[in-house]
Interface confidence: low
């Protein structure tokens, strides 16, 4: 570590004396320290002689010797007190730029350590301390505010009292810097824009950050557009913003328009697309298939998208029938906004019952006209079976009516014994009716079919059974000859 | 001229609900800079800033009322409405909206109610 | 909150006074601070935007002064049309916040 002469930490002298410093080390050793008038160098090998004939109070100051080939990096230091009656303070920087939180020193020494006790920090023109302002005093490095604010960017002046009245420094400018966490933040409004032409329409695009420095363009497709800026200070935050105003638009300002803000940080951009129609539209479309089908009892929503400009004047849900003459109630009915042309509209059908199947139609209206969209709401039900016996070309025959919807599958049974259902172990012959006859199909409504069994002789303690079944459900009826020789004739005319 | 003009019911109940609508003139809520507040006088007491709403629709709330109150904007119709639920009979004030100045950037962000209603006196009693 | 306390909470004088009132704000609010006159069954008015600033068509009678947390309304020459009360408006920080007013009454 290199050595100092005089061997004292400090060194307090008048204006005009002669001031010498040695520094001796190991190697080649150099001087560091504040930049100061009459101050001459002589270096001999492991020696260095700082000297001057005149000094004065900007000499004052930390005068550090290094030996640049120690790797430890050993140094020492004398601090010199040019003590002026007239000048109580040495500025070595007028300006001192941080960034905020950052400790901001603000370099004014004092010349004579024995006014240390009546230093202080001021706003120009003597005006206090901002409140909050956290601050400490070296007389060797002057004032530092610990943690400096962006609001504390203000001139300042070092105060001493010297006999009875305050000296103060020259002004010392602190610009406390904001830590740009990234580009500006960015709107572009509106996000999608539709006009047709002629009309007028208004694109902004703003940008704001914590710093006023920073730029902001608008380009349609890729073109800068030449905008006037306004400019603003709001919540803490500086913002620009360009305001497009096309008064008739034509294709040609359709496009792609940019919002493009940039600072020291980078680039952040954001797009919207501006469609120029030449008239009114309305287009109405669902994901849905337009046919449903729906067990009976179950829930069901039908949705509606709807692409529009210039907005919808009126829109609504009908039913059209067939069956009883209700209309779909308000609170069932949803409208939601996507974004400023797309609307999704549903209507919730929870639990249906027989008489709400049928069409409903979505109708929706804007300056194109109406337009509208209907839905096919079938119903499902599980088979309803019935049996009769009767005879047919005087034959006695059993007839099976299955109604239910999808059309319902017929499948005779024949057990043993009297039972409500033939069970496995009870089977004793099975038929199929592959085609039953259809009595009636109507749309929306139950498909009713007929499946005939012919029996010459209705056998006594046995079950005959009609089961039909669809893809909702089964139903079955269970019949019973009451006595054997009672239905083997017709019945009297 | 810059005109505001304050509309609601005289009257409400405990625990209802009061909307108040601010209709101006002689501005535009879209111009850049320019804000709409609320601010409420109870008998006999100080003045008591509840909302500003801003021409980029930014809202500010008494945090003291903050759960109870919304303050929305119409540019279209030039009107700006407060709501303010669960009123009390404390909430009985002359309730008045106020333009705020637009901004004159860069010297300073001036923020101030330069024009005035005439305020409207809701009284909340059973 | 920034609280804002007012003084006097009233005051008489005469005609022809001069009256001063403060506000003092629990923070420094960096001059953003406003005084309205208010009537009763009338709207307030601005007088002073930013502690100093006179507001356009009020009488040169009426100034603001201060900084930090310390702020004035001077009316150098009460006249019989300033009998009001008057309250100031921090707008520096949200909550914005009015004092508690000062009443000023015929001695």
């Known amino acids: 570590i290199p050595v100092i002469e005089p061997s004292v930490p400090e060194l307090v002298v008048k204006p005009g004396a002669t001031v010498t410093l040695r520094c001796v080390g190991n190697g080649s050793v150099e001087w560091d320290g504040p930049p100061s008038p009459h101050w001459t160098l002589y270096s001999d090998g492991s020696s260095s002689i700082l000297s001057t004939n005149n000094a004065t109070f900007q000499n004052t100051g930390t005068y550090r010797c290094t030996e640049p080939g120690d790797p430890l990096g050993g140094s020492a230091a004398i601090h010199l007190y040019v003590k002026d009656p007239a000048r109580p303070w040495n500025v070595l920087a007028q300006e001192v730029v941080v960034f905020e939180d950052q400790d901001a020193l603000l370099p004014c020494l004092l010349t004579d350590p024995v006014l240390e006790a009546g230093v202080s920090l001021v706003r120009v023109r003597g005006r206090p301390l901002m409140r909050h302002t956290n601050y400490s005093f070296s007389p060797w490095h002057g004032f530092t505010i610990h943690r400096a604010k962006f609001i504390q960017s203000q001139d300042y002046q070092c105060s001493a009292l010297m006999g009875g009245r305050k000296v103060m420094s020259i002004s010392i400018r602190l610009k406390v810097q904001k830590v740009i966490p990234g580009p500006p933040a960015l709107t572009l409004v509106p996000a999608e824009l539709v006009r047709i032409r002629g009309e007028a329409a208004q694109i902004v695009c703003s940008a704001s950050s914590v710093d006023v420095n920073f730029d902001v363009f608008l380009q349609h497709n890729n073109t800068k557009l030449a905008i006037p800026q306004q400019s603003d200070f709001h919540n803490n935050r500086y913002q620009k913003v360009l305001t497009l105003n096309l008064d008739q638009v034509d294709f040609q300002h359709a496009g792609n328009y940019s919002c493009v803000a940039s600072n020291v940080q980078g680039k952040h951009s954001t797009s919207m697309f501006f469609r120029v129609v030449e008239s009114a539209y309305l287009n109405l479309s669902s994901e849905q298939n337009l046919i449903q089908e729906v067990t009976v009892g179950e829930g069901l929503n039908l949705k509606v998208m709807v692409e529009a400009y210039p907005g919808l004047q009126g829109f609504n849900w009908t039913y059209l029938g067939p069956f009883s003459d209700h209309q779909p109630e308000p609170k069932l009915a949803n409208a939601t906004t996507k974004d400023t042309y797309r609307h999704t509209f549903t209507l919730s059908l929870p639990r249906l019952k027989p008489s709400e199947a049928g069409r409903y139609s979505f109708l929706a209206r804007n300056p194109g006209g109406w337009r509208a969209l209907t839905f096919e709401l079938t119903l499902r039900y599980p088979p309803e079976v019935s049996v009769i016996w009767t005879f047919i070309n005087g034959s006695g025959t059993l007839l099976c009516a299955a109604s239910g919807y999808p059309q319902p599958n017929v499948t005779w049974l024949q057990c043993s014994g009297h039972t409500d259902r033939c069970d496995e172990a009870q089977v004793l012959q099975v038929w199929d009716d592959p085609y039953p006859e259809v009595l009636s199909q109507e749309p929306f409504h139950k498909v009713t079919v007929q499946s005939l069994l012919t029996v010459e002789t209705l056998e006594h303690n046995q079950t005959y059974e009609c089961r039909a079944h669809n893809s909702v459900g089964s139903g079955s009826w269970a019949f019973i000859p009451i006595s054997a020789g009672a239905h083997t004739h017709p019945p009297d005319e | 001229e810059v005109t505001l003009k304050e509309s609601g019911p005289a009257l409400v109940k405990p625990t209802q609900t009061l909307t108040l609508t601010c209709t101006f003139s002689?501005?535009?809520?879209?111009?850049?800079?320019?804000?709409v507040g609320w601010i409420r006088q109870p008998p006999g007491k100080a003045l008591e800033w509840l909302a500003n709403?801003?021409?980029?629709?930014?809202?500010y709330y008494n945090p003291s009322l903050k759960n109870r109150l919304t303050i929305s904007k119409d540019t279209s119709k030039n009107q700006v409405v407060l709501t303010m639920t669960n009123m009390d009979p404390v909430d009985t004030a002359t309730y008045y909206c106020a333009r705020i100045g637009p901004i004159k950037y860069p010297t300073a962000p001036y923020r101030y109610f330069d024009f005035w209603g005439q305020g409207t006196m809701v009284t909340v009693s059973s | 909150d920034i609280q804002m306390t007012q003084s006097p909470s009233s005051l008489s004088a005469s005609v022809g006074d001069r009256v001063t009132i403060t506000c003092l704000a629990s923070e420094d609010i960096y001059d953003n601070l406003a005084w309205y006159q208010k009537k009763p069954g009338k709207a307030p008015k601005l007088l002073i935007y930013?502690?100093?600033s006179l507001q356009d068509g009020v009488p040169s009678r009426f100034s603001g002064s201060g900084s930090g947390t310390d702020y004035t309304l001077t009316i150098s020459s009460l006249q019989p049309e300033d009998f009001a009360t008057y309250y100031c408006?921090?707008?520096?920080?949200?909550?914005?916040?009015f004092g508690g007013g000062t009443k000023v009454e015929i001695k």
């Open positions: 709403i801003w021409w980029d629709d930014d809202k």
């Open positions: 002689g501005f535009s809520l879209t111009t850049y800079g320019m804000g």
């Open positions: 408006l921090q707008d520096s920080e949200y909550p914005w916040t």
């Open positions: 930013y502690a100093s």
